[in-house]
């Protein structure tokens, strides 16, 4: 962890600051094991929710989580954690896991005759237990979505219940 938090003589630009972490901030992950949905931030000295960096870069430490997050946003797909891939429900109906139930069963019962609000509910069933940030609805909104998770300390709803397709 040399260089972190240590000052040097002379001015330092942001470029210099980034040179202190040549492969990016997250090379320090090996120093700490964080839950799968989190990464170690060596400047904050704590594990942070991967959700906070999914839009910015695909770091190895958060790659699987960020893929699963974007996969869940696609209708008719689910994230297979064993294959580490986004799978189309259409290709496995008949032998489908529960994550595809809404899709495969709706294929059998065409939703054309359903009222629009029911149609939306059915097609969005996988997302229904969470808001856009992946936080379970019904849980009290505790702090911001980026809230750090020091094991044994307070947990935001993100850390308590990050929506994972299992």
């Amino acid at each position: 962890m040399s260089g972190l938090g240590r000052s040097r003589r002379g001015g330092r630009s942001r470029v210099d600051q980034e040179e202190r972490f040549p492969q990016g901030l997250w090379t320090g992950v090996a120093m700490r094991s964080c839950p799968e949905e989190q990464y170690w931030d060596p400047l904050l000295g704590t594990c942070m929710s991967c959700k906070t960096i999914c839009n910015h870069q695909s770091q190895r430490t958060c790659a699987a989580f960020c893929r699963s997050l974007s996969c869940r946003k696609e209708q008719g797909k689910f994230y297979d954690h064993l294959l580490r891939d986004c799978i189309s429900c259409a290709s496995i109906c008949g032998q489908h896991p529960k994550q595809c139930a809404y899709f495969c069963e709706n294929k059998l019962r065409s939703p054309v005759n359903l009222p629009p609000e029911l149609r939306r509910q059915r097609s969005g069933e996988v997302e229904n237990n969470s808001d856009n940030s992946g936080r379970y609805q019904g849980l009290e909104h505790r702090g911001s979505e980026a809230s750090p998770a020091l094991p044994g300390l307070k947990l935001s709803a993100d850390q308590v219940a990050l929506v994972y397709s299992t």
Epitope: M1, G5, R6, S7, G11, R12, S13, R14, Q17, E18, F21, G24, L25, M31, R32, L43, L44, G45, T46, C47, T52, I53, H56, Q57, A146, P148, L150, P151, G152, L153
Partner: antibody, heavy 114, light 111 residues
Framework: EVQLQQSVAELVRPGASVKLSCTAS????????IHWVKQRPEQGLEWIGK????????EYAPKFQGKATITADTSSNTAYLQLSSLTSEDTTIYYC???????WGQGTTLTVSS | DIVLSQSPSSLAVSIGEKVTLSCKSS????????????LAWFQQKPGQSLKLLIY???TREFGVPDRFTGSGSGTDFTLTISSVKTEDLAVYYC???????FGGGTKLEIK
């Protein structure tokens, strides 16, 4: 409940050394860093240094290099700040804080006087 | 070293007033890889230790009232208190996480 507990006050003779303690409860110090900060009315807040209790690595602000030594005992969940060759300049409040500054001890008032 | 300059050094306000505190850094605090600004805001009341209000320049810490808002990027940062309450009277410090330096503080007083 998460807390960082510090001794309230220390009175030490000039030239001597002192070891201030910071005991964490409610979390394991191995999961974060522990920083030490000095606060003097005229100088404001000065970062002394930090320790990574998981591996014992410590880092210091240049000003405190040689003056301060930060250690940690994970078995007692405690971090320490040792200050050597004390002078009146060292008379002030010292805080310990966790990780990104979410939790702070109540501060130890150090008085260096003969 | 990274120098943080806070202004004003003190500010007399009326209860219910909107307050804006400034913090300028001698170098950019934006880490481009994750687009986070490594700047925090702390509150210190007389005889007490510091309380974290904001980190990553704009992320409110757990339990902090939403009248406190952090904004800015790069070198210019602001802490806004939308409607000052009596309990907000304190000294406010900005701090950067690269080398852990603090600003000189802004003292918020009653007018």
């Amino acid at each position: 409940e998460v807390q960082l507990q510090q001794s309230v006050a220390e009175l030490v003779r000039p030239g001597a050394s002192v070891k201030l303690s910071c005991t964490a409860s409610g979390f394991n110090i191995k999961n974060t860093y522990i920083h030490w900060v000095k606060q003097r009315p005229e100088q404001g807040l000065e970062w002394i240094g930090k320790i990574d209790p998981a591996n014992g690595n410590s880092e210091y602000a240049p000003k405190f290099q040689g003056k301060a030594t930060i250690t940690a005992d994970t078995s007692s969940n405690t971090a320490y700040l040792q200050l050597s060759s004390l002078t009146s300049e060292d008379t002030t409040i010292y805080y310990c804080t966790s990780g990104y500054g979410a939790y702070w001890g109540q501060g130890t008032t150090l008085t260096v006087s003969s | 070293d990274i120098v943080l300059s806070q202004s004003p050094s003190s500010l007399a306000v009326s209860i219910g007033e909107k307050v804006t505190l400034s913090c300028k850094s001698s170098q950019s605090l934006l880490y481009s890889s994750n687009q986070k600004n490594y700047l925090a805001w702390f509150q210190q009341k007389p005889g007490q230790s510091l309380k974290l209000l904001i980190y990553w320049a704009s992320t409110r810490e757990f339990g902090v009232p939403d009248r406190f808002t952090g904004s800015g990027s790069g070198t210019d940062f602001t802490l806004t208190i939308s409607s000052v309450k009596t309990e907000d009277l304190a000294v406010y410090y900005c701090q950067q996480y690269y080398t852990w330096t603090f600003g000189g503080g802004t003292k918020l007083e009653i007018k």
